[in-house]
C-alpha cells in the first residue's frame, strides 16, 4: 500500500487584494479513508478554513468535485482576498474515526502573502549639466511593492553598471516597500545620445521587469572647440572670415564677432548642423571690408555656450598691399 503524501506545490503564493487565491493540494493515495480539511496556521489555535462535511465557508470553493469517488485533488479557491487572509495554509488529511476523525497527515503548507507590484521606476538625473570625463549621479525610485525582495539593475546603453548603491525601506515588516538606488556614471563625449536605464524585477511582475530611463543629453554639456580661418578667396574688397564652432551640446549658443575689440552688430551668415553623435556644429561667416582697413585688423569670434564663460578665438587678418590695390572681384 502506497504511503499517503500530501502535496502542496507552492511554498509561497502572492495574491492581490480583491482577487481570488487558489491553494493547491493533491494526495497520492485514497487511503486511509477520511476527509481533507484546510487550516490556516498551526497549533491548537489554528483556524479552520474549509471542511467539506460541515460548516459554512462562503468565500471558499473547491477546484475539483470532492464527491467524485477517486478524487485526489483537494485544492481550494478563496475569493475577495483581504489583508486579513495572509498566513500559511495547510491541507490536512484525517482518518475516518469516532468520536472524531483523526488527523493523519499534513501538507507542508503554502504561505499566502499580499503581493503588490512596484510602481514604474522614476529616474532622475543631476540638477546641473556636467562635462565629459566627470561623474554624475542618477537616482531611481520605485514604490508600493510587496514582498520586500526586489532586484534592481542599472544599464548604460545596454551595458550593466556596477557603481551603484541601493536601499529598500523600511527594513522591518511592512505592508509595502520602496526602493531607491543611486548610480554613478562617468560621462563620455559621445553620450549625448546615451541612455541610462533602471530595471526593477519583482515576483509580482512574472519575469517582466519594469524600466525607467533617463537621457544623458539632460546631464551632459559638451563644450565647443573654436577655429577661426580666413578664406583665401576675396569678393571685391571684402575678405570672408569663418568661425567654426564644433562638437558642442546643448544647442544653446551665442556667437559674436569683434573687430579690433569692437563688437560688430551687423548680421552675419551662419549654419547649424547636427553630428551623428548628437552634438552640433555652428559655422559663422564674417565679411570684412578691407578697402578702408589698416594692416593690423584683429577679428575675434566669441562664443558663449549654455550660460558658461565665453570662449574666443582671434585672427589677425592678412591683407596684402596687392590685395588693397586690387579692385576686381576675383582673387588672384
Amino acid at each position: 500500500e502506497e504511503e499517503l503524501q500530501m502535496i502542496q506545490p507552492e511554498k509561497l503564493l502572492l495574491v492581490t487584494v480583491g482577487k481570488t487565491a487558489t491553494l493547491h493540494c493533491t494526495v497520492t493515495s485514497l487511503l486511509p479513508v477520511g476527509p481533507v480539511l484546510w487550516f490556516r496556521g498551526v497549533g491548537p489555535g489554528r483556524e479552520l478554513i474549509y471542511n467539506q462535511k460541515e460548516g459554512h465557508f462562503p468565500r471558499v470553493t473547491t477546484v475539483s468535485d470532492l464527491t467524485k469517488r477517486n478524487n485526489m485533488d483537494f485544492s481550494i479557491r478563496i475569493s475577495s482576498i483581504t489583508p486579513a487572509d495572509v498566513g500559511t495554509y495547510y491541507c490536512v488529511k484525517f482518518r475516518k474515526g469516532s468520536p472524531e476523525n483523526v488527523e493523519f497527515k499534513s501538507g507542508p503548507g503554502t504561505e499566502m502573502a499580499l503581493g503588490a507590484k512596484p510602481s514604474a521606476p522614476v529616474v532622475l538625473g543631476p540638477a546641473a549639466r556636467t562635462t565629459p570625463e566627470h561623474t554624475v549621479s542618477f537616482t531611481c525610485e520605485s514604490h508600493g511593492f510587496s514582498p520586500r525582495d526586489i532586484t534592481l539593475k542599472w544599464f548604460k546603453n545596454g551595458n550593466e553598471l556596477s557603481d551603484f548603491q541601493t536601499n529598500v525601506d523600511p527594513t522591518g515588516q511592512s505592508v509595502a516597500y520602496s526602493i531607491r538606488s543611486t548610480a554613478r556614471v562617468v560621462l563620455d563625449p559621445w553620450d549625448v545620445r546615451s541612455q541610462v536605464i533602471c530595471e526593477v524585477a519583482h515576483v509580482t511582475l512574472q519575469g517582466d521587469p519594469l524600466r525607467g530611463t533617463a537621457n544623458l543629453s539632460e546631464a551632459i554639456r559638451v563644450p565647443p572647440t573654436l577655429e577661426v580661418t580666413q578664406q583665401p578667396m576675396r569678393v571685391g574688397n571684402q575678405v570672408n572670415v569663418t568661425c567654426q564652432v564644433r562638437k558642442f551640446y546643448p544647442q544653446s549658443l551665442q556667437l559674436t564677432w569683434s573687430e579690433n575689440g569692437n563688437v560688430c552688430q551687423r548680421e552675419t551668415a551662419s549654419t547649424l548642423t547636427e553630428n551623428k553623435d548628437g552634438t552640433y556644429n555652428w559655422t559663422s561667416w564674417f565679411l570684412v571690408n578691407i578697402s578702408d582697413q589698416r594692416d593690423d585688423v584683429v577679428l575675434t569670434c566669441q562664443v558663449k555656450h549654455d550660460g558658461q564663460l565665453a570662449v574666443s578665438k582671434r585672427l589677425a587678418l592678412e591683407v596684402t598691399v596687392h590685395q588693397k590695390d586690387q579692385s576686381s572681384d576675383a582673387t588672384p
Epitope: 491548537p44 482518518r95 469516532s98 468520536p99 488527523e103
Partner: antibody, heavy 117, light 107 residues
Framework: QVQLVQSGAEVKKPGASVKVSCKAS????????MHWVRQAPGQGLEWMGR????????KYAQKFQGRVTMTRDTSTSTVYMELSSLRSEDTAVYYC??????????WGRGTLVTVSS | DIQMTQSPSSLSASVGDRVTITCRAS??????LAWYQQKPGKAPKLLIY???TLESGVPSRFSGSGSGTDFTLTISSLQPEDFATYYC?????????FGQGTRLEIK
C-alpha cells in the same frame, strides 16, 4: 517494535502535581491521537482526554477540565499528562493509549500514581 | 454522557463453556463499540472493534455482535487464559466511556 513506554511510578502528596510521560516508537507518531485512561485500584477504566500530536490540540473529560494538561514533544515522539491539585482519589494507574479509528489498539504498561499524605 | 452498562458484573464458568457478556448503551452508539480484555496488573487488550470486527491476532473463539444500544461479546469455548475482566467501550461521542467491567472467574 510498535510500543508505548511510560515513565515510572510516582508518590505524591495531596495538592501536588504529577507529570507522566509516554514515549511512542515503531509508528508515525503524528498519525494517531494519544488518549489517557486511568484505573483506580479495583475499579473500571475512566477516559481522561486526548491530544492531537500534530497540532497539540486537546480535548478533556469535563471531570478533569482545569486540572489536567496534555502536551507533546514531536521531536522525541513523547506525550505528557500533568494532573494538578492531587487528592487521594486520584490514586490510580494512568495509561496512555493510541486510538485507532475508534478503539484503543495500543496501550502503555501504565504508571501508578499514589497520592498519600 | 453515554452510560455503558455491562451484565453480568461477574460470572463463573468452566473451561469449554460458551460465555456471553452483554453491554447496553444509554443511547445509540451505532457500531462504534469495542471490547477489551484485562488481566491483573496488565494494560487492557483490544479484542473486538466496530462491534464485530476481530482484532488481528485474537483467537476466533471471540466474537462480537450488535448495533445501536445492545451488544454482546461471546466466547464460544472458554480457555484457561480467558479468565480475566472484560470491558466494553463506546466511541460514538465524547466523552469516551467504558462499561464497569465483567469479571470472568473459573468455576
Amino acid at each position: 517494535q510498535v510500543q508505548l513506554v511510560q515513565s515510572g511510578a510516582e508518590v505524591k502528596k495531596p495538592g501536588a502535581s504529577v507529570k507522566v510521560s509516554c514515549k511512542a516508537s515503531g509508528y508515525t507518531f503524528t498519525s494517531y491521537y494519544m488518549h489517557w485512561v486511568r484505573q483506580a485500584p479495583g475499579q473500571g477504566l475512566e477516559w481522561m482526554g486526548r491530544i492531537n500530536p500534530n497540532s497539540g490540540g486537546t480535548k478533556y473529560a469535563q471531570k478533569f477540565q482545569g486540572r489536567v494538561t496534555m502536551t507533546r514533544d514531536t521531536s522525541t515522539s513523547t506525550v505528557y499528562m500533568e494532573l494538578s491539585s492531587l487528592r487521594s482519589e486520584d490514586t490510580a494507574v494512568y495509561y496512555c493509549a493510541r486510538l485507532g479509528s475508534a478503539y484503543f489498539d495500543l496501550w502503555g504498561r501504565g504508571t501508578l500514581v499514589t497520592v498519600s499524605s | 454522557d453515554i452510560q455503558m452498562t455491562q451484565s453480568p458484573s461477574s460470572l463463573s464458568a468452566s473451561v469449554g463453556d460458551r460465555v456471553t457478556i452483554t453491554c447496553r448503551a444509554s443511547q445509540s452508539v451505532d457500531t462504534w463499540l469495542a471490547w477489551y480484555q484485562q488481566k491483573p496488573g496488565k494494560a487492557p487488550k483490544l479484542l473486538i472493534y466496530e462491534a464485530s470486527t476481530l482484532e488481528s491476532g485474537v483467537p476466533s473463539r471471540f466474537s462480537g455482535s450488535g448495533s445501536g444500544t445492545d451488544f454482546t461479546l461471546t466466547i464460544s469455548s472458554l480457555q484457561p487464559e480467558d479468565f480475566a475482566t472484560y470491558y466494553c467501550q463506546q466511541a460514538n461521542s465524547f466523552p469516551i466511556t467504558f462499561g464497569q467491567g465483567t469479571r470472568l472467574e473459573i468455576k
